[in-house]
C-alpha cells in the first residue's frame, strides 16, 4: 500500500481543516488508514482523524481544530496499521479556504432596487470576520448568456443593484462566495443559490 498523491490540506481558519490524498489502488480509507495530526508544540495533544473514501483510491479527512492562529503549524502522519506511509506538515494560515457565506436573501420590495444580503460565515472574534470580500453571481434561468459577477470589496455583506440592470419578467438566481486577501485564500464554495422573479416598472417614455 502506497500513497500515490500526497495529502493536500485546506483550513476554514475556524474549526476544520480538510485533507485529501490518493492511494495507489482501491482502499477502504476508514478501516485501513489513520491520519494523526499534532500542533508543533511540545505539550500539544496528538489527534487522530478517521478518513472517508473519496472515489475509489481517494481519501478525505476532516481534522478538527478548535482554535486556529497564524503561528500554528501541524505535523501530519499517515498510517496504515503500524506502517508510516507519509509524513508532512501543514500551516493552516497558508492554506485557507473560507467557509461559504449563508442566508442569501434577495429583497425586491425596495423601489426598483434589488438588495441582496447574506451572512458572514465567521463569528466576530474570528480574524477573518473583518477581512472577507465577496463575489456575487447572478444568472438567468432562461438565458445561459445572461450571467454576471459583482465584486463586493467592502466589508458589509450586501449588494444593491438597480432592478433595471436585469431583464424584467424573468426568473434569476444568485449565489455568493468569499475570500480574504490578507491570507491570500482561495475562494470559498458558493453559497446555496436563491431564486426570485425580476419585475420592475419600465420608465414612462414621453414623446
Amino acid at each position: 500500500m502506497k500513497v500515490l498523491q500526497e495529502p493536500t490540506c485546506v483550513s476554514d481558519y475556524m474549526s476544520i481543516s480538510t485533507c485529501e490524498w490518493k492511494m495507489n489502488g482501491p482502499t477502504n480509507c476508514s478501516t485501513e488508514l489513520r491520519l494523526l495530526y499534532q500542533l508543533v508544540f511540545l505539550l500539544s495533544e496528538a489527534h487522530t482523524c478517521i478518513p472517508e473514501n473519496n472515489g475509489g483510491a481517494g481519501c478525505v479527512c476532516h481534522l478538527l481544530m478548535d482554535d486556529v492562529v497564524s503561528a500554528d503549524n501541524y505535523t501530519l502522519d499517515l498510517w496504515a496499521g503500524q506502517q508510516l506511509l507519509w509524513k508532512g506538515s501543514f500551516k493552516p494560515s497558508e492554506h485557507v479556504k473560507p467557509r461559504a457565506p449563508g442566508n442569501l436573501t434577495v429583497h425586491t420590495n425596495v423601489s426598483d432596487t434589488l438588495l441582496l444580503t447574506w451572512s458572514n460565515p465567521y463569528p466576530p472574534d474570528n480574524y477573518l470576520y473583518n477581512h472577507l470580500t465577496y463575489a456575487v453571481n447572478i444568472w438567468s434561468e432562461n438565458d445561459p448568456a445572461d450571467f454576471r459577477i459583482y465584486n463586493v470589496t467592502y466589508l458589509e455583506p450586501s449588494l444593491r443593484i438597480a432592478a433595471s440592470t436585469l431583464k424584467s419578467g424573468i426568473s434569476y438566481r444568485a449565489r455568493v462566495r468569499a475570500w480574504a486577501q490578507c491570507y491570500n485564500t482561495t475562494w470559498s464554495e458558493w453559497s446555496p443559490s436563491t431564486k426570485w422573479h425580476n419585475s420592475y416598472r419600465e420608465p414612462f417614455e414621453q414623446h
Epitope: L39, V40, F41, L42, L43, S44, E45, A46, H47, T48, L64, D66, D67, V69, A71, D72, N73
Partner: antibody, heavy 118, light 111 residues
Framework: EVRLVESGGGLVQPKGSLKLSCEAS????????MNWVRQAPGKGLEWITH??????????YYADSVKDRFIISRDDSESMVYLQMNNLKTEDTAMYYC?????????WGQGTSVTVSS | DIVLTQSPASLAVFLGQRATISCRAS??????????MHWYQQKAGQPPKLLIY???NLESGVPARFSGSGSGTDFTLNIHPVEEEDAATYYC?????????FGSGTKLEMK
C-alpha cells in the same frame, strides 16, 4: 464562549481531603490538556498538575509539591476535570484555578478558594 | 525545572509612557522556530488573563498597546502608551516543558 467553572473549595483541617471540580463549556473539551494552577494569598502563580487528552492516554503530571498527595482526573462525557487533594497541608491554602492548555494556558476559571487550617 | 526571573518586581510609570518588563529563563524556551514564552495580566480578585502567547503574538481582544519580543532566554513585555486600566500584576510563563513555571510577577502602578 469558553467557560471554566471551579467548585468544591472550602475550609479543611490539616491532613484532611477535598475534591475540586471544574466544569468546562464552549470548546471541544476532549481535544485539550487541562491543568490546575494555584495561587497562595498574596503570592505568585504555581502550576500543580496537568492531564492530557484520551488520544494521549490521559497521561498525568504533577509538581513535586503535590506529588503523591493530589490526583487529577477528567470525564470527557461530562466535560469535567477533578482534583482530589489528600493529606492537605497549611501551605496548600490557595485559590485553585482550572486552566485550559493549548499554545499557552489560555483560558482560566474564576477559581475556588481552599483554606487548610486547624 | 526552568526558572523564570522577572524584573523589576514593581514599576511605577506615568500615564502615556512606556512600561517595560523583562523575563529571563534559566535555559532556552525556544525550539523548532517557536518561543514558548507567554505573558499574563492579573488584577486583584481576578484570574490571570493571557495577553501575549509564543513570545510576540497578541491574544485576541487584547489592545495593541501590549507587545512582546525576545527569543531563547530573554523576553520583554512592553506596554505603550500605558493607560489607567493597565495597573495590575504581570507574569511571564513558559510551556517549553513540564513542569510549567511562572515568573514571580511585576506589579505595575501609575505615578
Amino acid at each position: 464562549e469558553v467557560r471554566l467553572v471551579e467548585s468544591g473549595g472550602g475550609l479543611v483541617q490539616p491532613k484532611g481531603s477535598l475534591k475540586l471540580s471544574c466544569e468546562a463549556s464552549g470548546f471541544s473539551f476532549n481535544m485539550y490538556a487541562m491543568n490546575w494552577v494555584r495561587q497562595a494569598p498574596g503570592k505568585g502563580l504555581e502550576w500543580i498538575t496537568h492531564i492530557r487528552s484520551k488520544s494521549n492516554n490521559y497521561a498525568t503530571y504533577y509538581a513535586d509539591s503535590v506529588k503523591d498527595r493530589f490526583i487529577i482526573s477528567r470525564d470527557d462525557s461530562e466535560s469535567m476535570v477533578y482534583l482530589q487533594m489528600n493529606n492537605l497541608k497549611t501551605e496548600d491554602t490557595a485559590m485553585y484555578y482550572c486552566v485550559r492548555l493549548l499554545r499557552a494556558l489560555d483560558y482560566w476559571g474564576q477559581g475556588t478558594s481552599v483554606t487548610v487550617s486547624s | 525545572d526552568i526558572v523564570l526571573t522577572q524584573s523589576p518586581a514593581s514599576l511605577a510609570v506615568f500615564l502615556g509612557q512606556r512600561a517595560t518588563i523583562s523575563c529571563r529563563a534559566s535555559k532556552s524556551v525556544s525550539t523548532s522556530g517557536y518561543s514558548y514564552m507567554h505573558w499574563y495580566q492579573q488584577k486583584a480578585g481576578q484570574p490571570p488573563k493571557l495577553l501575549i502567547y509564543l513570545a510576540s503574538n497578541l491574544e485576541s481582544g487584547v489592545p495593541a498597546r501590549f507587545s512582546g519580543s525576545g527569543s531563547g532566554t530573554d523576553f520583554t513585555l512592553n506596554i505603550h502608551p500605558v493607560e489607567e486600566e493597565d495597573a495590575a500584576t504581570y507574569y511571564c510563563h513558559h510551556s517549553r516543558e513540564l513542569p510549567i513555571t511562572f515568573g514571580s510577577g511585576t506589579k505595575l502602578e501609575m505615578k
